[in-house]
């Protein structure tokens, strides 16, 4: 039975040209995290595998940095980066958990972080 929950940074905003950290955290389970995939819509950004380390998609290599932890740092943001991001946790023995983050990239300096929220 899957008892865990994914906590994410929720809805966040950032300035064009700046950077942002995407973070998810798996709680309420003793399952072992074997891999975390980061995806934007249907496009793979990066994978963090417990044994193999990080794989950053070649098309994002210049502006995606691994970490901190299992999170992902997006740099040199453009308005095209606005959208949904997903952290997909592969765990043993539970299976797969998915968290969602919505990022809005703003032209002005009114970017503020949204509140944290949980996805069961």
């Amino acid at each position: 039975m899957m008892t865990g929950t994914i906590e994410t940074t929720g809805n966040i905003s950032a300035e064009k040209g700046g950077s942002i950290i995407l973070q998810c955290h798996l709680s309420s389970t003793t399952a072992q995290v074997t891999q975390v995939n980061w995806e934007q819509q249907d496009q793979l950004l990066a994978i963090c595998n417990a044994d193999l380390g990080w794989h950053i998609s070649p098309s994002f290599k210049d502006r995606v940095a691994p970490g901190p932890g299992l999170g992902l740092t997006l740099q040199s943001l453009t308005v095209n980066d606005t959208g949904e991001y997903f952290c997909i946790y592969h765990t043993y023995p539970d299976g797969t958990y998915t968290g969602r983050i919505f990022l809005e990239v703003l032209e002005s300096s009114v970017a503020e972080h949204g509140a944290r929220f949980q996805i069961p």
């Epitope: 793979l44 595998n49 044994d51 193999l52 794989h55 998609s57 070649p58 290599k61 797969t96």
Partner: antibody, heavy 119, light 107 residues
């Protein structure tokens, strides 16, 4: 088009070392990890290690730690694998291969380099 | 280590036949599996990655399916150039491992 050209066949004595090169062209060298795989005569495929030219970080199959050392020269888009303390059972074709866009698979392969270890 | 068991180890088939090769990892690898084709004296060539995705240039007669611990490579209508050895590989942990290969021969 993407191409990986490996150095020529080598014959070495037991205990010696050998350095195999893999020259990449047709893509941005630093964006893709380079993998090394070997195939003993008449046998299957065995992964050795890979290196990320972007940061120089390497990940090894534990079985080849201390045997294989990977390096890159990004200025000439070339990856290298040095094999040390060669034994007769290291006789194999050694392949370099460019990693995939979406994970740890091997998208494009070099033609292979036969390393023969014989006294 | 994740062990990759391919079956059969060899098979004989005729041009036009439908051919199926199975790969069974020793543990759940989700869909992190690729397939390669190797002809004698040549380097392997990627046929499928992530269990079912064909790279550009691979003929559509090749298809992959499966997830977890049961995967299949299918050649819908065998062509003369398809006689070769096929390998599966997981890309989910260290070490990356390959199946022992399936040799497809002419009947």
């Amino acid at each position: 088009q993407v191409q990986l050209v490996q150095s020529g066949a080598e014959v070495k004595k037991p205990g010696a070392s050998v350095k195999v090169s893999c020259k990449a062209s047709g893509y941005a060298f630093s964006r893709y990890s380079m993998y090394w795989v070997r195939q003993a005569p008449g046998q299957g495929l065995e992964w050795i290690a890979f290196i990320d030219p972007y940061n120089g970080g390497s990940t090894y199959n534990q079985r080849f730690r201390g045997k294989a050392t990977l390096t890159v020269d990004t200025s000439i888009s070339t990856a290298y694998m040095e094999l040390s303390r060669l034994r007769s059972d290291d006789t194999a074709v050694y392949y370099c291969a460019r990693g995939g866009d979406y994970g740890w698979y091997l998208g494009v392969w070099g033609q292979g380099t036969l390393v023969t270890v014989s006294s | 280590d994740i062990q990759m068991t391919q079956s059969p180890s060899s098979l004989s088939a005729s041009v036009g036949d439908r051919v199926t090769i199975t790969c069974r990892p020793s543990e759940n690898i989700y869909t992190y599996l690729s397939w390669y084709q190797q002809k004698p004296g040549k380097a392997p060539k990627l046929l499928i990655y992530n269990a079912k995705t064909l790279p550009e240039g691979v003929p559509s007669r090749f298809s992959g399916s499966g997830s977890g611990t049961d995967f299949t490579l299918t050649i819908s209508s065998l062509q003369p150039e398809d006689f070769a050895t096929y390998y599966c590989q997981h890309h989910y942990g260290n070490p990356l491992t390959f199946g022992q290969g399936t040799k497809v021969e002419i009947k």
